[in-house]
Interface confidence: low
């Protein structure tokens, strides 16, 4: 079998809301993946599991099942959303994210994603990790070409 390539493209959008009483930030982060099938047969993308970390703490997880199949020598772009919550011991971030006098409220998040593909009964997992800046102070949509600009570190091999 030839390789199945997973490329994390970046954050597509981040939608934010707040709970003033609980000093809590809710961020729905939509990410984009490109999955390329370099084989001469179809493969199934069985599931995508993702999690987001802030300051080494997991703040959100998501799992998508039975997503799609990818034809021979084909590529599919898949968006997935991870709902995240910044609260409790990280509630100090509430002040930063709601501070009106600065224009960009960037926080550094680690995006972790694992894609499970199957073909002929064989299962393969491919993982990526990427640090990204996300604006926690407003709803933001990013151009896909912009994502590389947002990358702080290259993915770990």
């Amino acid at each position: 079998p030839r390789s199945i390539d997973v490329k994390y493209i970046g954050v597509k959008s981040a939608y934010v809301s707040y709970d003033v009483q609980k000093r809590t930030i809710y961020l729905n982060i939509t990410n984009t993946l490109n999955i390329t099938n370099n084989n001469y047969y179809s493969v199934e993308v069985e599931n995508i599991t993702a999690q987001v970390q802030f300051a080494k703490t997991v703040i959100g997880k998501a799992r998508l099942n039975n997503i799609t199949h990818i034809g021979p020598l084909d590529m599919k772009q898949i968006d997935y959303t991870v709902p995240t919550v910044i609260a409790e011991e990280m509630s100090y971030m509430y002040d930063f994210c709601t501070l009106i006098s600065i224009k960009v409220h960037n926080i550094v998040l680690m995006m972790q994603v694992t894609v499970t593909t199957t073909y002929f009964g064989h299962s393969e997992q491919i993982s990526q990790e990427r640090y990204q800046y996300v604006d926690c102070g407003r709803n933001t949509t990013y151009q896909l070409g912009q994502s590389e600009y947002l990358n702080v570190l290259q993915p770990q091999q």
């Epitope: 709601t98 009106i100 006098s101 600065i102 960009v104």
Partner: antibody
Framework: EVQLQQSGPVLVKPGPPVKISCKAS????????IHWVKLSHGKSLEWIGL????????DYNQKFKGKATLTVDTSSSTAYMELNSLTSEDSAVYYC???????????WGQGTTVTVSS | DIVMTQSPSSLSVSAGEKVTMSCKSS????????????LAWYQQKPGQPPKLLIY???TRESGVPDRFTGSGSGTDFTLTISNVQAEDLAVYYC?????????FGAGTKLELK
């Protein structure tokens, strides 16, 4: 140890521009905003503007637009301020400072004295 | 622009005394989103850069002695120094930390009697 090391004092003639620097160390340069503040003799502190090293974004006090230009070189973790069309009014001590969670600078450079004199 | 007005412009004190200085802003510095007041206090000694003492109107910066206390809300703020020490002699500035352009008061100079 967090440090903002500014360039030395300068004595310049009226007219030509001057560029002063602020080298950061001891923290992640692109995570902070770098502010510039002017202290004139017998006057209060005046906020000139800020630059965000992460993307080069700037915000100026309207009063200093056209007078000051703020830039960064992330490869050397250095912020720069260029002052043009110099007059005696520009004679002052200029400070760089950093902020993160708010706009209260917690670390300041030692200051650069600019003297404009013919 | 938000105008910051400090009073008095100078204060003469003896060591051990308690002093208060005032700062008024032309607009409220209260952020309704999180109910915090965005005002800072700085201390500046001759030949030195300003030093952050208080932010958020009342939160002491780490390492700042607890004899420095910030209070107030909205447009009226106060810095109190109890048991003044000789090393406290300096100019004290308040700063609008709420919106651009950031603005400073003219300062209150603390002198020895």
């Amino acid at each position: 140890e967090v440090q903002l090391q500014q360039s030395g004092p300068v004595l310049v003639k009226p007219g030509p521009p001057v560029k002063i620097s602020c080298k950061a160390s001891g923290f992640t340069f692109t995570d902070y905003y770098i502010h510039w503040v002017k202290l004139s003799h017998g006057k209060s502190l005046e906020w000139i503007g800020l630059v965000y090293p992460y993307n080069g974004d700037t915000d100026y006090n309207q009063k200093f637009k056209g007078k000051a230009t703020l830039t960064v070189d992330t490869s050397s973790s250095t912020a720069y301020m260029e002052l043009n069309s110099l007059t005696s009014e520009d004679s002052a001590v200029y400070y760089c400072a950093r902020t993160y969670y708010a706009n209260s600078p917690d670390y300041w450079g030692q200051g650069t004295t600019v003297t404009v004199s013919s | 622009d938000i105008v910051m007005t400090q009073s008095p412009s100078s204060l003469s004190v003896s060591a051990g005394e308690k002093v208060t200085m005032s700062c008024k802003s032309s607009q409220s510095l209260l952020n309704s989103g999180n109910q915090r007041n965005y005002l800072a206090w700085y201390q500046q000694k001759p030949g030195q850069p300003p030093k952050l003492l208080i932010y958020g109107a009342s939160t002491r910066e780490s390492g700042v002695p607890d004899r420095f206390t910030g209070s107030g809300s909205g447009t009226d703020f106060t810095l109190t120094i109890s048991n003044v020490q000789a090393e406290d002699l300096a100019v004290y500035y308040c700063q609008n930390d709420h919106s651009y352009p950031l603005t400073f008061g003219a300062g209150t100079k603390l002198e020895l009697k």
